[in-house]
Every structure is written in C-alpha cells, then in structure tokens.
Amino acid sequence: MMTGTIETTGNISAKKGGSVILQCHLSSTMAQVTQVNWEQHDHSLLAIRNAELGWHIYPAFKDRVAPGPGLGLTLQSLTMNDTGEYFCTYHTYPDGTYRGRIFLEVLESSVAEHSARFQIP
C-alpha cells in the first residue's frame, strides 16, 4: 500500500537568465528510493538520480542543469522555452512509483514573483 506523499515547490516563477531549484520531497513512507527521474514538459528526460550509480544528466542540458540540492534539480541560464511543467518521478521499494508536478514560468521582467527558499540569486 502506498502511504507516501510527494510535496513539490508547486507553481513557481523565475527570471529569464536566472536560476531556479526544482524540488520534490517524499514523506510519510519508509520506502527506499531507488531512482528519481526528472522530466520536462514534453516528457523528455532531463536527469536521473540513481541511488547506487548517482546522477546522470541529459547531454544537451549538461551546461545548464546541475544536480541537487538533495534529490532536486537546479536549472540555470533560464530561457523562455523553459516555461512549462516539470515532473519528478520517485521509484521506491516496496511502495512503487510516486510522481510530483511543478509548473515553472520564466518571466521577461526584472522582478520574478518567487519564493526565496527555492530561488538562487
């Protein structure tokens, strides 16, 4: 039985050219996380964090996607094309798969409404 829940940063906005942290947190379960997959709005895979074999970043994003903090993902040098949905998929044992959604809006303006907790200056 899946007892856990995924908490995410929800809907967030950040400034073009800036950076943002995408964060998901799995709680209320003792299940072991075997792998976390981060996918972009078009369902392309951005990154994998395997419990044994570490982080793997899609080559086209290597220069502007940084692993972490924790199981999160940092997107750098944001462009308008980065606007859209992002999904974290937690593969766990014995529970199974948990999935979280984040919506990122990249803003042209110099002021981006965004929780400081998840924004990198």
Epitope: T34, N37, I48, N50, H91, T97
Partner: antibody, heavy 117, light 106 residues
Framework: EVQLVQSGAEVKKPGASVKVSCKAS????????IYWLRQAPGQRLEIMGR????????YFVDKFKNRATITTDTSASTAYMELSSLRSEDTAVYYC??????????WGQGTLVTVSS | DIQLTQSPSFLSASVGDRVTITCKGS??????LVWYQQKPGKAPKLLIY???NLQSGVPSRFSGSGSGTEYTLTISSLQPEDFATYYC????????FGQGTKVEIK
Amino acid sequence: EVQLVQSGAEVKKPGASVKVSCKASGYTFTEHSIYWLRQAPGQRLEIMGRIDPKNGRTYFVDKFKNRATITTDTSASTAYMELSSLRSEDTAVYYCARIDGFYFDFWGQGTLVTVSS
Amino acid sequence: DIQLTQSPSFLSASVGDRVTITCKGSQNVNKYLVWYQQKPGKAPKLLIYSTDNLQSGVPSRFSGSGSGTEYTLTISSLQPEDFATYYCYQYNNGFTFGQGTKVEIK
C-alpha cells in the same frame, strides 16, 4: 572515431585479483563517465560501477562495493577496473562502456577473465 | 529495478525475413528503452535509443516501437550481417538488460 580498447584475457586463481584496462580515444576523456559491466556465461549483462574521469568519483552497485576498484589515468585516457578476492563465479567477460546521458553508446571489445584453480 | 524479459531467446530465420523481437518489462519502462546488437567476440553496438530513435549509421531496416511494458525491435529484411545477439536495456528504474535474443541462420 570513438574507440574503447581493453586489455587482453586473463586467467586467475581463486582469491587473486585482476586489473583490466580500457583505453579511450576519439573524444574528450573527461566529458563522459566510464562504466564497467560484466557478462558471466549464460547470464545477462550486469553493471558493476562507474567513474567520472573529470573528478575521479566512483559509484558501485552494492554487489561489487567491497571488491571492485575503478580508477583512471586521465593523462593516458585510460580507465581501470580491479576486482579482488576472485572466485569461480567471477569468470566472465568484462566490458568498459562510455555513457552518453542515460545509455551506453560505445563499448570496449570485452576482456575474458577466467577464475580457475 | 525493472526486470526485462526478451522473447524469443533464440530465433532461426533466413536472409530476407522480417524479424521481430519483444522485450517486456516487469514495470512501466516509460519508453526509456534501448536496443543493442552484439556479434561473438565484439563490442555491443547501439542500434536504437528511446524506444524508436535510430542511432546514426544504423541501417533503416532496423526499427523500434512500444510503450508501457512492451517493446519490439523489428528487422524488416534480415541481412547476412544481422545474425547476432540482440539485447534490450532500460533506464526508467535502475539500469538493466534483457537476457538476449540470438538470431541464427535457418
């Protein structure tokens, strides 16, 4: 042209160690992780571990954590895998492979390691 | 980790035949599936990545398809150089390989 060239076949006694080399050419060695995999007779391919030549950081699957060592010599664009305390079940073909994101795009030709008393 | 089961394990075919190999996952593979070809004493060769993308330099007679837990590799017209062992590999949950399908001359 990307190439991974491995060292030759080895015959070892139980309890001994073996060190296999993998020389890379045709690309910037530090830009891709090198994985080591093996295939025992009649078994499927299994991953042993990984090294990031850029920083020397290694990762191992639990099964090999205590017995395998992976190193690189970046000046020679060469990766090494050493497996200790060999037993007969370690008889296998050992492969190095370059990973491109999430899958292996180029492989070495394989090194047969035979463990026999 | 996801377990992959290929079928058949052995396949006898003739030059010109259409050949289909299936790879089934114990869980959803989410299209994160790759196919390799291996000839005796040689390095495995990447054929198809992300279910249906042909690797550069691979002949167009090779194609891949599938979704969820079930995937296929198709060789539209088998050539003499295609007699080999084929492996599927997934990275959706862990990094695992199928047991292989050996394509032999009939």
